[in-house]
Amino acid sequence: MAVTACQGLGFVVSLIGIAGIIAATCMDQWSTQDLYNNPVTAVFNYQGLWRSCVRESSGFTECRGYFTLLGLPAMLQAVRALMIVGIVLGAIGLLVSIFALKCIRIGSMEDSAKANMTLTSGIMFIVSGLCAIAGVSVFANMLVTNFWMSTANMYTGMGGMVQTVQTRYTFGAALFVGWVAGGLTLIGGVMMCIACRGLAPEETNYKAVSYHASGHSVAYKPGGFKASTGFGSNTKNKKIYDGGARTEDEVQSYPSKHDYV
């Protein structure tokens, strides 16, 4: 039961995280105009990965897409790439994890296959989360660098008469959405990997244990202890063989393929 819960929760957390990564990638407010010097501005600028926008006090908002690829900063391109890779990996991870869910039965899929799929999706979620966190962090670092550079050149006097106020940008909402979403996807991935350990089929546990025969010999079939007796009446003895990794009721809730002969 705990494994199902861990896997299910990991899936849900990752799903929320990936939705957040998609939202962050699409959001226009990656960087917003710093209002420290002018809190009541009549023209408010903000920028995303795909377009920059201006919101006037009149309520009129104008957005212009970045219609060039080569003219854009390499860092911005890198951030775009990281976010897209994160989304793609996350989407594939979600697809894989749906089939890996313990609560969903697809034909006669073995536990080992489900365990492998859970691990695969978990790794994908971890990498997806890391991509998002990296992308957002690279953009944030770029902002910090530009912020202090523009602060140094904040006012350039033209003959001491005309002031040219340089627009400074600070962290936008998308950065925080991205960080949180990346973190959630990462956590979801870790949960899936943890769930994978619990999903590993029983025979793998047996191989790891050295057995010492005591008087009578028992023939161990690939299906495990239950398969040798033909029914699950010997579950009380199970803890001897799997190192106490699972409780009795967990064994009953995860039937192997040999239970349906």
């Epitope: 023209v43 920028q47 201006v54 006037e56 006090s57 009149s58 309520g59 040219t164 106020v165 340089q166």
Partner: antibody
Framework: QIQLVQSGPELKKPGETVKISCKAS????????MNWVRQAPGKGLKWMGW????????TYAEDFKGRFVFSLETSAATAYLQITNLKSEDTSTYFC???????????WGQGTSVIVSS | DIVMTQSPSSLTVTTGEKVTMSCKSS????????????LTWYQQKPGQSPKLLIY???TRESGVPYRFTGSGSGTDFTLTISSVQTDDLAIYYC?????????FGSGTKLEIK
């Protein structure tokens, strides 16, 4: 078409209060900011401030903080300018104007003349 | 506050003549985000309310005759009337729409001979 109709001229004594109305028609008042502009006799235009359409929050220019109050009555599609403790230097024509694209004042009321005299 | 300086304070011209008036701002009115200059021109005829002529320094408001042209960028702006008509007798004001408080120039009075 869009129209801003202001209340009639006012003759007041110093220390009194005046409330000028500006009724909007042809558009939704709550979609656009309302600005107030003062023009003293024979002088230029002076921006007094504006009131945000969605929140109804007023912003006042430095010279108009204190005795001047902007308000909105959305149900009546009317904006108001109230001046308390009138002084002779408040004698002016007061205009309401809609804030539009480009932060421009695209539609103006006909103006309300306020004369403060003892 | 941004200070708007208009020159000349008054102009006397004959009909059909080309006229230009200047407006200078103490701060840059060019917004880097959309590369637009937040400068507006208004026309106020005697006894009337001001009327919007040009916004974003060079965009003509609908219904405004083609003889009115706005130009300039940053801090220096110009309003040009290519062929003055008697109907153009008015005071012309420029306005900063870039930052609060919005400020107007002192105006240029156009008189017809």
């Amino acid at each position: 078409q869009i129209q801003l109709v202001q209340s009639g001229p006012e003759l007041k004594k110093p220390g009194e209060t005046v409330k000028i109305s500006c009724k909007a028609s042809g558009y939704t008042l709550t979609n656009y900011g309302m600005n107030w502009v003062r023009q003293a006799p024979g002088k230029g235009l002076k921006w007094m401030g504006w009131i945000r359409p969605n929140t109804g929050e007023p912003t006042y220019a430095e010279d108009f903080k204190g005795r001047f109050v902007f308000s909105l009555e959305t149900s009546a599609a009317t904006a108001y300018l109230q001046i308390t403790n009138l002084k002779s230097e408040d004698t002016s024509t007061y205009f309401c104007a809609r804030l539009y694209r480009g932060n421009t004042l695209d539609n103006w009321g006909q103006g309300t003349s306020v004369i403060v005299s003892s | 506050d941004i200070v708007m300086t208009q020159s000349p304070s008054s102009l006397t011209v004959t009909t059909g003549e080309k006229v230009t008036m200047s407006c200078k701002s103490s701060q840059n009115l060019l917004n880097s985000g959309n590369q637009r200059n937040y400068l507006t021109w208004y026309q106020q005829k005697p006894g009337q309310s001001p009327k919007l002529l040009i916004y974003w320094a060079s965009t003509r408001e609908s219904g405004v005759p083609y003889r009115f042209t706005g130009s300039g960028s940053g801090t220096d702006f110009t309003l040009t009337i290519s062929s003055v008509q008697t109907d153009d007798l008015a005071i012309y004001y420029c306005q900063n729409g870039y930052s609060f408080p919005f400020t107007f120039g002192s105006g240029t009075k156009l008189e017809i001979k």
